[in-house]
């Protein structure tokens, strides 16, 4: 489509025919008038004039005559100053001047808002030779104008090391309002005022806004842009939007939801990664956010034994990553375990709880009343002991561990000996004569291995000696009873 | 210290519903579980149910489903148990217990239920 | 369900005397057995938990012993003090279940 044009300075008449701002339609004028410059309707004209080849900017043959030693100063040729036109229209322009021929190397060049304009555009030069002068016209088209090609635009020509700059063409683009800035999607405190901001641009201005909630417009007169809506406080989610109006019509900006902060979903999918004796590592998936970050757990874990005290452990964490791992339970017990996590508003509902058991642990006592001594034949040492008082939750009692160490001058040996869970005593062989052995027994269950008694020391005399007196584990407080021969 | 404290009898007629209370003090009553023991008089003890305050989780005796009911008020420190459509058979002495390292150790005086016309 | 069987229903001693409960369980309860003593107009007390625990302040004299499903509890020269009902409880499992009780009185 070619352009309407309106000029807003009033140059001289370009042409004897139409006038300014109207369609310009006889295409032989610009034939006929050599020496015109200024607006021509888009597409008017072929690159090259019938007869006459293209040639860009070429060197001007020189033409010497009695009138031409008093030139007048070169100039650019009046020419419409302001162009207005809506997006997506075609507009052309132009730029003349008559250069005596006494001049070479011409070139004409295209500037918008001071920076050269190079490569794409469509520019065209043309020259109409005459005896004395040529008259060139520099045109400019832009196909389907938008917002960018504002400006004020120029023609340069260099000749002779000299530059002359035509009067600028100011490209006014008019269109609906275009926003530069639009309201965004916020979360919002109950009851709690916010801004929405919203900013449109023309040309045309002034640009008139109405705000716009859930469908229904909030203010009854526009305000200018830009524009400042407060809010005094929602109640629940509502979706704003704005509207800017200028005579070329409306603009909708993106409706944007103001979503109310409230406490987070209760998390989901407790699930149990690994559990010890003493440990169990949980995840879970977060509930929705309730639109405010999460910003820690809580992990809650209570006894479900039957006859549990029941008591509520309560462990924070962070709120990512969305694991934990649960210290300090006891072995072989039953849990029940719940995750909360909370927002600047406050804390979710529990999730749905999860039964969850630890395996079983180790002892945690060491057997009692360790009795040590040497048998008759000296070969053997005999150790008694009781079974110690173990919890079920340590685990079913598989055996013993027997710890004895041997000292003597220059010699520290330790060996270890498992017996079964039916067992109270044991017999190990005399390792070493005239020498120390030290002895200790922890309980084993499938859960690992328990404390070790208190030590009990035996002297193991050289051979020949004999004597039936035992050693054993002392009242509390002798703390390394040593048995003497 | 630990007191779980009840009212000392309730007399009630057949076919009515009684509310037995427990208020607890001494300790964190969200914390612990809470449970329910009948002894008729002369006989043995019977497990009714027990009830978690920190989210009211429930155990019960299926004995005494559609029984008792258990419930607790955390504003209050104070268990709940209501007995419904009582009969003779549900005269007794019912106590509030709480357990503590592995054994009923802290229990109520025990409320007195008298069923009669 | 796990039922308890405790005997014997009663049993008359003379002060000093030994005195032996029973209570044998319809499962295996490990060694969650509980031993409660109940005087007259009084709630019952627990004497040895889980475990076979004496609880602290009860005394020496009273024990207890087994493991599975088979529980004895044991007064050692018994006391005038030491009349009233005892009763087990297993807390093995739910519902917790009570022995049947046991009345001790001194010849």
């Known amino acids: 489509a070619i352009t309407e044009a309106r000029e807003e300075a009033k140059p001289y008449p370009l042409f004897p025919g139409p006038l300014p701002g109207s369609l310009q339609t006889d295409h032989t004028s610009l034939l006929s008038l050599p020496h015109t410059s200024g607006y021509q309707p888009a597409l008017m004209f072929s690159p090259t004039q019938p007869g006459r080849p293209y040639t860009g900017n070429v060197a001007i043959p020189r033409v010497t005559s009695a009138g031409s030693k008093l030139l007048p100063p070169l100039a650019f040729k009046h020419t419409v100053g302001h162009i207005i036109l809506s997006e997506h229209k075609d507009v052309k322009f132009n730029c003349s001047i008559s250069v005596p021929n006494i001049y070479q190397d011409t070139t004409i060049s295209w500037w918008k808002d001071g920076k050269e304009l190079l490569g794409a555009h469509h520019a065209i030069t043309q020259f109409y030779p005459d005896d004395e002068v040529t008259a060139i016209i520099a045109s400019f088209s832009i196909t389907s104008v938008q917002r960018s090609d504002n400006g004020s635009y120029i023609c340069k020509m260099k000749i002779n090391n000299e530059e002359i700059v035509s009067d600028p063409i100011y490209i006014e683009v008019q269109g609906l309002p275009h926003f530069t800035k639009q309201p965004e999607s916020m979360n919002v405190t109950r009851n709690t005022a916010f801004n929405l901001t919203c900013q449109a641009v023309g040309p045309p201005e002034p640009v008139n806004i109405f705000w716009v909630q859930n469908s229904s417009r909030v203010n009854e007169q526009p305000e200018k842009s830009p524009s400042v809506l407060t809010v005094p406080g929602l109640t629940e989610m509502a979706v704003f939007s704005c509207e800017a109006h200028n005579d070329k019509g409306l603009t909708v900006s993106k409706g944007v939801q103001i979503n109310i902060k409230a406490i987070p979903s209760p998390p989901t999918e407790v699930s149990i990664h690994n559990s010890t004796a003493h440990s169990i590592l949980i995840s879970w998936v977060p509930g929705f956010d309730g639109y405010s970050p999460f910003r820690n757990c809580s992990v809650q874990v209570k006894e479900v034994d039957p006859l549990s005290n029941g008591s509520v452990m309560i462990f924070n964490t962070s709120a990512s990553p969305h694991m934990y791992q649960i210290k300090q339970l006891q072995a072989l017990a039953n849990y029940s375990i719940g995750v909360s996590c909370m927002n600047e508003i406050g804390w979710s509902a529990v999730s749905p709880w999860i039964l969850a058991s630890t395996t079983e642990g180790a002892p945690s006592v060491a057997p009692l009343n360790v009795t040590v001594f040497l048998n008759e034949s000296r070969d053997n040492v005999d150790i008694r002991w009781m079974k110690p008082l173990t919890k079920r939750q340590a685990g079913e009692l598989v055996g013993y561990r027997i710890s004895h160490v041997w000292q003597s001058a220059g010699i520290s040996k330790e060996l270890l000996e498992e017996v079964g869970q039916n067992n109270s005593r044991a017999q190990i062989s005399v390792q070493v004569h005239n020498a120390t052995c030290t002895v200790r027994i922890a309980a084993v269950t499938k859960g690992g291995v328990g404390p070790f008694s208190d030590p009990v020391k035996i002297f193991i005399p050289a051979h020949g000696w004999v004597d039936h007196a035992p050693s054993s584990t002392p009242a509390p407080g002798n703390a390394d009873p040593v048995l003497i021969i | 210290q630990v007191q779980l404290q009840q009212p000392g009898a309730e007399l009630v007629k057949p076919g009515a519903s009684v509310k037995v209370s427990c208020k607890a003090s001494?300790?964190?009553?969200?914390?612990?579980?809470m449970h329910w023991v009948k002894q008729r008089p002369g006989q043995g003890l019977e497990w009714i149910g027990r009830?978690?305050?920190?989210?009211?989780?429930?155990n019960d005796n299926q004995k005494f489903k559609g029984k008792a009911t258990l419930t607790v008020d955390k504003s209050s420190s104070t268990a709940y148990m209501q007995l419904s459509s009582l009969t003779s058979e549900d005269s007794a002495v019912y106590y509030c217990?709480?357990?503590?390292?592995?054994?009923?150790?802290?229990w109520g005086q025990g409320t007195l239920v008298t069923v009669s016309a | 369900e796990t039922t308890v069987t405790q005997s014997p229903a009663s049993l008359s001693v003379a002060t000093g005397e030994k005195v032996t409960i029973r209570c044998i369980t319809s499962?295996?309860?490990?060694?969650?057995m509980n031993w409660y003593q109940q005087k007259p107009g009084e709630p019952p007390k627990v004497l040895i938990s889980e475990g076979n625990s004496l609880r602290p302040g009860v005394p020496s004299r009273f024990s207890s012993s087994g493991y599975g499903t088979d529980f004895v509890f044991t007064i050692e020269n018994t006391l005038s003090e030491d009349v009233a009902d005892y009763f087990c409880l297993q807390s093995d499992n739910l519902p917790l279940t009570f022995g049947s009780g046991t009345k001790l009185e001194i010849k």
């Open positions: 009830i978690h305050p920190f989210d009211t989780e429930t």
């Open positions: 001494g300790y964190t009553f969200t914390n612990y579980w």
């Open positions: 217990v709480i357990p503590a390292n592995g054994g009923f150790a802290y």
């Open positions: 499962t295996d309860i490990g060694d969650d």
